[in-house]
């Protein structure tokens, strides 16, 4: 029946990038300028999507599929299909409701999006910290201290980062 | 006035190729789509495909890979080329024209003018 029902129906002969006209006698139209239909058997088109002010066209909008955005220089995307931008920060910052703030000490940011998280605690591991942490930049854990017994070859760890109040804890 | 005039049908064997031509003439026609149609004995006119406003070339699933539409746009002329016709093909063909009222291309309007030719009959004989 539902096969029957399909050869019937004259809108699902309509291919993607028309619609199924109801005021002509329910023939395919192509769809109106700057609209478009994904699929068959559409009866309307969807009007494209447009990329204004801090979106920026990332694909065209075609009679068959809809303009795709992103964002532009100093922004990035949230949301499913780019739904909205975001103001980029530095590294070593994070977005609050008062624009970039620096990351507070014992934490980091190695992007221009998100949040500044806590720096790795080594010691948890029961190893120590190589290389110290920064607001862009993690520590680096290194062997423990027991692993460094006479015999072994030594770790040299390399110069502290030159960041006053930076050391970790 | 607009008019479109279709040219170029026949009778054919199955499997041969013919082309339909369809001019457009008339005062400050903008179409933002074209469009073939046909309408076979005792049916309902069907779609065959369309030029489309970003120029997309879309054709029915019976017709696809065997007709190709182009156009010439310093003779305002489009074209049905047909190959591998089937009895299943013999049909009056239309071409069609379609515009939006007052060149209004930022709203999604469905307020379209089209325009239709008088149509060229083909007809396959197995």
């Known amino acids: 029946f539902e096969r029957t029902r399909s050869l019937q129906d004259p809108c699902s002969n309509c291919p993607a990038g028309t619609f199924c006209d109801n005021n002509r006698n329910q023939i395919c139209s192509p769809c109106p300028p700057n609209s478009f239909s994904s699929a068959g058997g559409q009866r309307t088109c969807d009007i494209c999507r447009q990329c204004k002010g801090v979106f920026r066209t990332r694909k065209e909008c075609s009679s068959t599929s809809n303009a795709e955005c992103d964002c532009t220089p100093g922004f990035h995307c949230l949301g499913a299909g780019c739904s909205m931008c975001e103001q980029d920060c530095k590294q070593g910052q994070e977005l609050t409701k008062k624009g970039c703030k620096d990351c507070c000490f014992g934490t980091f940011n190695d992007q221009k999006r998100g949040i500044c998280r806590p720096w790795t605690n080594c010691s948890l591991d029961g190893k120590s910290v190589l290389v110290n942490g920064t607001k862009e930049r993690d520590v680096v854990c290194g062997p423990s201290p027991a692993d460094l017994s006479p015999g072994a070859s030594s770790v040299t760890p390399p110069a502290p980062a030159r960041e006053p109040g930076h050391s970790p804890q | 006035e607009v008019q479109l005039v279709e040219s170029g049908g026949g009778l054919v064997q199955a499997g041969a190729s013919l082309t339909l031509s369809c001019v457009i003439s008339?005062?400050?026609?903008?179409?933002?789509?074209m469009g073939w149609y046909r309408q076979a004995p005792g049916k309902e006119r069907a779609f065959v495909g369309t030029i489309t406003w970003n120029n997309d070339i879309i054709y029915s699933d019976s017709v696809k890979g065997r007709f190709t539409i182009s156009t010439d746009d310093g003779k305002n002329t489009m074209y049905l080329q047909m190959n591998n016709l089937k009895p299943e093909d013999t049909a009056v063909y239309y071409c069609a024209a379609y515009s939006v009222p007052y060149g209004d291309f930022c709203t999604l309007n469905y307020d379209l003018m089209d325009y239709w030719g008088k149509g060229t009959l083909v007809t396959v004989s197995s």
């Open positions: 008339g005062r400050t026609f903008s179409s933002y789509a």
